[in-house]
């Protein structure tokens, strides 16, 4: 069975084809080759000589037991080599010779028992080494690591490392890898020698499900003393053994580390006193809790020095009390409990993401809701009922506003966005908005992107609501049940490049409303009910138009519409997916491609 | 279509068939077997995925006595610092995991429950597997 050609001459998928040897019938130009799940078993030298241009090679689960000297010799362009799930028993010292451009080596679940005799010391270009899910017992980083000066990611998770000693990291003192991210999760740790991490600098350290008791956790974290880490991730996994007890003593040792960003990811335990618990983390710049349950929500009003707070997928009794002077970014998403938003006091806040919480807002939105006048980014998407009771007074700095899939109330009672002269992006898609007031978008003089799909208009008519949006480049009006539009609806949109009118109820096409759209490049009218043109004589669309989508409409392929069908043929160079433009009537022509019709009308006259 | 039996409990019998053409082997054990009136137990899965499990989610199509419920999307792996350790599993890596579950206070009417589980993962998104579970429910007391 042949390999699947994914990208001609470049990418080939030969997965699970029962190959016992490497195929030689693929082009020399092959750059990406997936040979996974084939019983190759043995790689002799120069095994891939037929692929001189290869950049990515996937040999996952190929039952490889032996890799000879120079197996990959000649692959000087290879950047990624994946060996996951091979039961390697014999790995020659020169197994990886010739890989002068290798950046990513994945040797997950390959029976690797030690880093010491893993022959990779010459791979100077290596950026990522993944040796997770192996049998490694010692964390001693061999001397050859001093050659791996580009290493950025080392994944040692799911190994058998129990202890870390001062000598294990000696090589890092000789060559401070300022950018190294280290994952030690799921190793059964019980001892970290104090001083082992002294004066070590890491970009990221991940320790999840490493400790089987609170005491072990406490002493191991104390053993990290002296470490300078940009991002520290602690926590557990839901499907692994969890700590039975967790209290403030667990994290006391963090006072002896220098941490820029901290994250606690999943804890099967109720956090009831976060002030004491995170006492050593009051001055990290970014603080993050993922999948934890928080009992006392008042604690977030303590004077933490965080600039970025992230609360994701957590459980709260009620919406937390947030009073944080220095906070610039707040991400509060996909949380449960506390369904009603309550005011926060965050005077420095610039970025606020409150999406996917099922929250309801009794009144939205003004400075008093968020306690800031600096807000530039506000995401309230995928929430509950949001009642518009103020037009963003004190929030004039906003540049990005997203309400999609929330239920907006009172949108047509006043000019909701009047203050937002700096707003660039607005998404009110699928918000149950019914446009019944022409001043709905007044004030949005800087707006470039407007998404309002899935809403509705009074009498299914699009009025002149865009008159002030002179900088608009993208407009989505799809799924709005529109049947008609004002001939001057788009007259002020001279910068508009993309207009989506798909999935509406238009029965005819008219070029007149688009005459002022001098920058229009994409017009999508797919999934309407277009049968014919509004007027007999259709003019040309703006000369800038490059893509016109008229697919899945109800074209009437009869003589009375001959001029319209001819006009469509004349637009051929603009049309996309022409094979999906089919006749709907008459019944004998149903399903026929519109462009293949030979329209001669004598016989039917 | 070959049917794979999972388990029987006092009020339910659970089995599954594959609904994709690849039919990559997957081993599923539930201990103790699910009782629909209330249940607490462990789900054990042994599987070698044909693609990375990063950004794994399930599309669930549930049918109750021939009545179709709306499609549900259950995100399992978001992509970074996920709740489950198997979210970091790579294509070809053995996934051998036990997940605890519990639910209570749901009253099910007697009949045949079908649940098509479409597992989607990776970037670009592709189907990982598709299983159709059949639960025959015979409540002791309705």
């Amino acid at each position: 069975e042949p390999c699947v050609e994914v990208v001609p001459n470049i990418t080939y998928q030969c997965m699970e084809l029962n190959f016992y040897k490497i195929p030689d019938n693929l082009p020399f130009s092959t750059k990406n080759l997936d040979l996974s799940f084939n019983p190759l078993r043995h790689l002799g030298s120069y095994s891939f000589f037929s692929f001189p241009e290869l950049q990515v090679l996937d040999l996952s689960r190929c039952e490889i037991q032996t890799i000879e000297d120079g197996a990959y010799q000649s692959l000087s362009h290879l950047s990624t080599l994946i060996l996951t799930g091979n039961p390697i028993q014999s790995l020659a010292l020169g197994a990886f010779s010739g890989l002068s451009s290798l950046q990513k080596l994945v040797a997950v679940e390959t029976n690797l028992a030690s880093l010491e005799n893993f022959p990779i010391g010459h791979l100077k270009t290596l950026k990522e080494l993944n040796v997770a899910h192996n049998l490694i017992q010692s964390f001693k980083l061999p001397e050859y690591f001093s050659n791996l000066t580009n290493l950025e990611h080392l994944d040692l998770s799911s190994n058998k490392i129990q202890s870390i000693y001062c000598t294990d990291l000696r090589v890092l003192h000789q060559m401070p890898l300022l950018n190294l991210s280290l994952d030690l999760s799921l190793n059964p740790m019980n001892f970290i020698q104090p001083g082992a991490f002294k004066e070590i600098r890491l970009h990221k350290l991940t320790l999840r499900n490493n400790f089987d008791s609170l005491n072990v956790m406490k002493t191991c974290i104390q053993g990290l003393a002296g470490l300078e880490v940009h991002r520290l991730v602690l926590g557990e996994f839901r499907n692994e053994g969890n700590l039975e007890k967790f209290d403030k003593s667990a994290l006391e040792g963090l006072c002896n580390l220098t941490i820029e960003e901290f994250r606690l990811a999943y804890l099967d335990y109720y956090l009831d006193d976060i002030i004491d618990l995170f006492n050593c983390l009051t001055n990290v710049s970014s603080f993050s809790l993922v999948s934890v349950t928080i009992e006392r929500v008042k604690d977030f009003s303590y004077n933490f020095g965080w600039q970025h707070l992230e609360l994701v997928n957590c459980k709260f009794g009620q919406f937390p009390t947030l009073k944080l002077k220095s906070l610039k970014r707040l991400t509060f998403t996909s949380n449960k409990g506390g369904n009603a938003f309550s005011e926060v006091d965050l005077p420095s806040l610039e970025f606020l993401d409150l999406s996917r919480n099922g929250l309801s807002f009794k009144g939205c939105c003004s400075q008093s809701d968020f306690g800031t006048t600096s807000l530039k980014y506000l995401d309230l998407s995928f929430n509950g009922v949001i009642t518009m009771s103020s037009n963003f007074l004190g929030l004039e700095q906003l540049e990005h506003l997203d309400f999609q899939h929330s239920n907006l109330k009172q949108m047509s009672e006043f000019s909701v966005f009047l203050s937002l002269r700096n707003l660039i992006y607005l998404d009110i898609s699928h918000t149950h908005t019914r446009v019944a007031f022409n001043g709905i978008f007044n004030g949005l003089s800087s707006l470039e992107v407007l998404k309002m799909a899935g809403n509705s208009f009074q009498e299914n008519f699009l009025p002149d609501i865009f008159t002030e949006l002179r900088n608009l480049t993208f407009l989505d009006l799809s799924q709005c049940q529109l049947e008609q539009l004002s001939p001057t609806a788009f007259n002020s949109l001279s910068s508009l490049q993309v207009l989506n009118m798909s999935h509406n109820n238009f029965f005819s096409l008219d070029t007149f409303p688009y005459k002022c759209l001098n920058s229009l490049q994409v017009l999508d009218y797919s999934l309407n009910h277009i049968m014919t043109s509004k007027k007999q004589e259709l003019q040309h669309f703006p000369s800038s138009l490059a893509f016109l989508n008229l697919t899945q409409n109800d074209f009437a392929c009869t003589c009375e519409h001959q001029s319209f069908l001819q006009w469509i043929k004349d637009q051929r160079q603009l049309l996309v997916e022409v094979e999906r433009m089919e006749c709907a009537t008459p019944s004998d022509k149903q399903g026929m491609p519109v462009l293949s019709l030979n329209i001669t009308c004598q016989m039917n006259k | 279509q070959k049917q794979y039996w999972v388990c029987n409990s006092s009020d339910a019998s659970i089995s599954y068939t594959y609904c994709d053409k690849m039919q990559y082997p997957i081993s599923i054990n539930v201990n103790p077997c699910i009782e629909l009136k209330r249940s607490k137990g462990l789900l054990h899965i042994f599987y070698i995925p044909r693609r990375d499990l990063k950004q794994l989610y399930f599309n669930l199509y549930i049918t109750v006595n021939t009545m179709n419920l709306p499609k549900r999307k259950e995100v399992i792996c978001r992509g970074s610092d996920d709740d489950y350790s198997f979210c970091r599993a790579l294509k070809g890596e053995t996934v051998n995991t036990t997940i605890s579950f519990s639910f209570k206070g749901i009253k099910f009417s007697k009949g045949k429950y079908k649940c098509v589980v479409e597992a989607i993962s990776g970037s670009p998104e592709e189907m990982l597997f598709c299983l159709e579970f059949v639960i025959l429910h015979q409540p002791n007391s309705n």
Partner: nanobody, 112 residues
Framework: EVQLVKSGGGLVQAGESLRLSCVAS????????MGWYRQAPGKQGESVAI???????YYPDSVKGRFAISRDNAKNTVYLQMNSLKLEDTGVYYC??????PGQGTQVTVSS
């Protein structure tokens, strides 16, 4: 056991030509991809010519138009014709059958 015996290396001047040949024993080359790989001192090794069973060939840009690979299945031999040799063509040239490795190298030295 597969053996590859090479001949034709030596010292030549820039601009001159040289022909390398490689005779295989213990295997029939008619079903094998064959090629030449070179290793210059202090430089990254590279494949300089490959020929498949159907006669299709590959050359990197560095030798394209100057080198030509050919095979004689009857003689179980593969050849490398090297024309307009440059100083940077100096190195040890190996005859290769994928998965079976190279034979002994043959030294080619191009002098000015």
């Amino acid at each position: 056991e597969v053996q590859l015996v090479k001949s034709g290396g030596g010292l030549v001047q820039a601009g001159e030509s040289l022909r390398l040949s490689c005779v295989a024993s213990g295997i029939s080359i008619s079903t094998e991809v064959m090629g030449w790989y070179r290793q210059a001192p202090g430089k990254q090794g590279e494949s300089v010519a490959i020929i498949k069973t159907d006669g299709s060939t590959y050359y990197p840009d560095s030798v394209k138009g100057r080198f030509a690979i050919s095979r004689d299945n009857a003689k179980n031999t593969v050849y490398l014709q090297m024309n307009s040799l440059k100083l940077e063509d100096t190195g040890v040239y190996y005859c290769v059958i994928p998965g079976r490795g190279p034979g002994q190298g043959t030294q080619v030295t191009v002098s000015s």
